[in-house]
């Protein structure tokens, strides 16, 4: 029984090597900001919003673009019980989170933090929804540079337990305190997985499009009490979103989020799914995707089962791409891949062949000329439109995962089985 | 159920312009890409080209480009097929055809006459 | 383009008969997502074409089962187990794979 299938990261649950490398992996990283700088022209700002500040309500970091460039870089993981819950998430013991701690706790992100947004241009959207076992941080990578090219960037915090762990308030006096309710990542049983993944991405769904709505609400001048204490105005956000250039992107269960999100609200004009992890989904979405919809794999992650379904998307009367980054794994869509030195990167998975700048350059630069096409941008965004199709020696176009002889065999699978 | 409504006959002169109209109903309009098909005496059938609804991308058989503009109204769920620079090799009838794992629910149909 | 070459032309069948039709397309039908958009369509005089099966095989709502289809790649046949007279008119195959869609010349089913 293989566990990819439904559990994109189970190859990290392993706990024995963690303690070996722990020494290793302090000299490859401590306290250093290795992610890298957008490459586009927009200086890049970052703030939190919570609101409200129930489990119910949105939580997000944004990216975007930003008016000045002097300001203090963004801590990369801002509270201890993220690590608490990433070293649960890897199933090694409550210490190990301190020892994360340790060597990431200081480490900081290439943007401005609560830096004033820059005027006097409509900016489009993206709502980004985080992998398993992530949160609303971990793909600054990503957040960062689209908003160097002029997208504002949600990056939304899961509350259907998908996250390692994330925080709201009690109630309104809670908030006003700071007074965190932490909420950790759920763990199933095998029998739970297909029912539970299910609900999760159904509510993951709804929470991309309720921060929509919230970041909509706030661009028509509704007034919102940000429940963290922040220096950044949202009003600043008033008039600023060019409301028909809305996309929603997202890695592994995010990506899975994207074609549930595109399934429900039409609000989304296209989809990026990073990388999915198509378990979650139930049969009923895959005919249901009017919007463009761009699938970017690694190499090293896809496995038949899995792409048998992004193909489910497919119909030859509506726009599907795909795409493969030679020799990238899982995590080369998510901030750990520039968090460690090389050797120990390949050895936790968090780097592939490939060099991890160049694999999320080819990345962004693919989905910038998709969101240039199907949200009508006039920008140059068009200059990597070869990569859409996969043409460059480091891209395969569609996919290297052979489905011949597959769909049989998964239409009387019980769904949960990898095949080889 | 699925009702797909076009306009009434039409004569017209060689040379003119004529649309045709193709209201939706009794489904989600912008979730189904809607076909334009061509037939000419009574039988041989010609696919003209598809719109998607949801945000106006078109694809059109190579045959017709320039003769057939394809547009949507989402506000009234309607579909509409503009014929340019008419011809007596453009009179047929006109359908208007849902996709839905392939060619789907058509319409009643709409006869153009190009004469003088 | 792709060429959808139906025959026979024409089929002279007497009530309760079987009936038979093929449709040979010049490339596989075979799309990536698996599926083959193979479609069979009866235009009954003076009437829109409505179609009887999707999919190579799956009959549309309110099809009879007397009506089949079956094959794959670039070979299929619609089958009718006992003709009736309602079933009289243009049968034609149609292919949305690859574009342009495309459609077979039809056959025309009278009762003898």
């Known amino acids: 029984f293989d566990w990819q299938y439904i559990n994109p990261v189970a190859h990290m649950k392993s706990s024995a090597w963690v303690n070996k490398i722990q020494v290793l992996m302090a000299a490859a990283s401590f306290g250093q900001t290795k992610i890298p700088r957008g490459n586009g022209p927009y200086s890049v700002g970052c703030t939190d919003l919570m609101f409200d500040h129930t489990n119910k309500g949105t939580f997000l970091r944004l990216y975007y673009p930003s008016q000045d460039n002097d300001r203090l870089d963004t801590l990369w993981i801002p509270n201890k019980e993220y690590f608490w819950g990433l070293s649960k998430f890897l199933g090694t013991h409550w210490l190990m989170g301190n020892i994360l701690r340790l060597l990431f706790g200081s480490m900081t992100t290439p943007a401005n933090w609560n830096s004033p947004l820059r005027p006097g241009e409509k900016y489009p959207l993206v709502v980004f929804s985080h992998g398993l076992g992530a949160f609303r941080t971990l793909y600054s990578a990503i957040g960062i540079d689209l908003a160097s090219h002029g997208f504002i960037v949600a990056a939304v915090e899961h509350r259907d337990r998908s996250a390692s762990a994330t925080y709201y308030f009690k109630d309104q006096s809670a908030a006003e305190i700071g007074d965190k309710s932490w909420l950790y990542l759920r763990t199933l049983k095998q029998e739970e997985e297909t029912h539970i993944r299910n609900e999760q991405v159904r509510q993951r769904a709804k929470e991309c499009s309720q921060a929509l709505s919230l970041i909509l609400d706030i661009d028509h001048g509704k007034p919102v009490k940000n429940a963290l204490d922040l220096k950044f105005d949202m009003e600043q956000l008033k008039d600023s979103i060019d409301r028909e250039k809305i996309a929603v992107i997202g890695h592994s269960f995010g990506g899975a989020t994207v074609i549930q999100t595109l399934s429900e609200d039409q609000r989304f004009r296209c989809g990026i799914a990073l990388d999915a992890w198509m378990f979650p989904l139930g049969d009923e979405v895959y005919s249901r995707i009017p919007q463009p919809l761009f699938f970017i794999n690694s190499e090293y992650f896809q496995y038949p089962a899995n792409i048998i379904k992004m193909k489910k998307c497919y119909s030859p009367d509506k726009e599907r791409k795909m795409i493969t980054i030679r020799g990238s794994v899982h995590q080369n869509f998510a901030d750990f891949t520039f968090a460690t030195g090389k050797i120990i990167g390949h050895m936790l998975k968090l780097k592939g062949d490939i060099d991890s700048n160049v694999a999320i350059d080819l990345s962004n630069k693919a989905s910038l000329a998709f969101l240039q096409k199907h949200l009508g941008l006039h920008k140059d965004f068009d200059q990597w439109d070869c990569l859409i199709e996969g043409d460059d020696e480091n891209l395969i176009p569609g996919t290297n995962i052979n489905t011949t002889n597959q769909h049989i065999m998964l239409q009387n699978s019980s769904g949960i089985e990898k095949y080889n | 159920q699925v009702k797909l409504e076009e306009s009434g006959p039409e004569l017209v002169k060689p040379g003119a312009s004529m649309q045709i109209s193709c209201k939706a109903s009794?489904?989600?309009?912008?979730?189904?890409?809607m076909n334009w098909v061509k037939q000419s005496h009574g039988k041989n059938l010609e696919w003209v080209g598809l719109i998607n609804p949801f945000n106006g991308d078109t694809t059109y058989n190579q045959k017709f480009k320039g003769k057939a503009t394809l547009t949507v109204d989402k506000s009234s769920s309607t579909a509409y097929m503009d014929l340019l620079s008419l011809t007596s090799d453009d009179s047929a009838v006109y359908y208007c055809?849902?996709?839905?794992?392939?060619?789907?629910?058509w319409g009643q149909g709409t006869t153009l006459t190009v004469s003088s | 383009d792709i060429v959808m070459t139906q025959t026979p032309l024409t089929l002279s069948v007497t009530i309760g008969q079987p009936a038979s039709i093929s449709c040979k397309s010049s490339q596989s039908l075979l799309y990536i997502n698996g599926k083959t958009y193979l479609n069979w369509l009866l235009q009954r005089p003076g009437q829109s074409p409505k179609r009887l099966i999707y999919l190579v095989s799956k009959l549309d709502s309110g099809v009879p089962d007397r009506f089949t289809g079956s094959g794959s790649g670039t070979d299929f046949t619609l089958k009718i187990s006992r003709v009736e007279a309602e079933d009289l008119g243009i049968y034609y195959c149609?292919?949305?794979?690859?574009?342009?869609?495309?459609f077979g010349s039809g056959t025309k089913l009278e009762i003898k």
């Open positions: 149609v292919q949305g794979t690859h574009f342009p869609f495309t």
């Open positions: 009794g489904y989600s309009f912008t979730v189904y890409t």
């Open positions: 055809v849902r996709f839905w794992e392939g060619i789907d629910f």
